[in-house]
């Protein structure tokens, strides 16, 4: 089942080196993590990969008051092409679906290394 | 948190055929390798099936090749496989799980008992 790694759909994608420290932030937050990440607040999920970075901004972008991802939500407003702001809904994401944010950042965190080891990042 | 509820098993005859389910919920399943294993009567678990995040890569033990049939809609969170020709031997718990390399990513489901028999 090794040989199953994701393949990353085109779209905006950020040099190696800025996914690279992204990932870094992604494993920082869930190996750090104590108390629940964010008082354990909610996201949309996503359903796609296409537009990812956007996604997964807007998901994000929706917790405030939040310092342990405020990092990753500007890391990932460097990736997305257009503004995004708190109450947009994307069509990626998966309506009426919504999982805590420390289960979405260890999501997020396997997306990219995916993304990461098959070389999407140019 | 994190839930994989399996479906669609049953009894059948053999040369019969089944759609299993696996509903997802808890986590972003369309960023997620999954899969099926099968834990038959005695016997020790075995991986059937697995498939890539958006569909486009698939194993099949050779067990069950040309026969069984994996598939994914991300947009409905659920994971299928179809199963034909059914014999005997598939009779097994089936389980749906992710199919990451990192156990740190590992979910299960609890399971659907498929029954071939006549």
């Known amino acids: 089942l090794t040989c199953l790694g994701g393949f990353a759909s085109p779209g905006p994608v950020p040099p190696s080196t800025a996914l690279r420290e992204l990932i870094e932030e992604l494993v920082n937050i869930t190996q750090n993590q104590k108390a629940p990440l964010c008082n354990g607040s909610m996201v949309w999920s996503i359903n796609l990969t296409a537009g990812m970075y956007c996604a997964a901004l807007e998901s994000l972008i929706n917790v405030s008051g939040c310092s342990a991802i405020e990092k990753t939500q500007r890391m990932l407003s460097g990736f997305c092409p257009h503004k995004v702001s708190a109450g947009q809904f994307s069509s990626l994401h998966v309506r009426d679906t919504k999982i805590e944010v420390a289960q979405f950042v260890k999501d997020l965190l396997l997306h990219l290394k995916k993304l990461f080891r098959e070389g999407q990042f140019n | 948190g994190v839930q994989l509820l399996e479906s669609g098993g049953g009894l059948v005859q053999p040369g019969g055929s089944l759609r299993l389910s696996c509903a997802a919920s808890?986590?972003?399943?369309?960023?997620?390798?999954m899969g099926w294993a099968r834990q038959a009567p005695g016997k020790g678990l075995e991986w059937v099936s697995a498939?890539?995040?958006?569909?486009?890569?698939?194993y099949y033990a050779d067990s069950v090749k040309g026969r069984f049939t994996i598939s994914r809609d991300n947009s409905k969170n659920t994971l299928y496989l179809q199963m034909n020709s059914l014999r005997a031997e598939d009779t097994a718990v089936y389980y749906c799980?992710?199919?990451?390399?990192?156990?740190?990513?590992?979910?299960w489901g609890q399971g659907t008992l498929v029954t071939v028999s006549s």
């Open positions: 799980a992710t199919a990451e390399r990192d156990d740190t990513f590992d979910y």
């Open positions: 808890g986590f972003t399943f369309a960023w997620y390798d």
């Open positions: 498939i890539d995040d958006l569909g486009r890569r698939t």
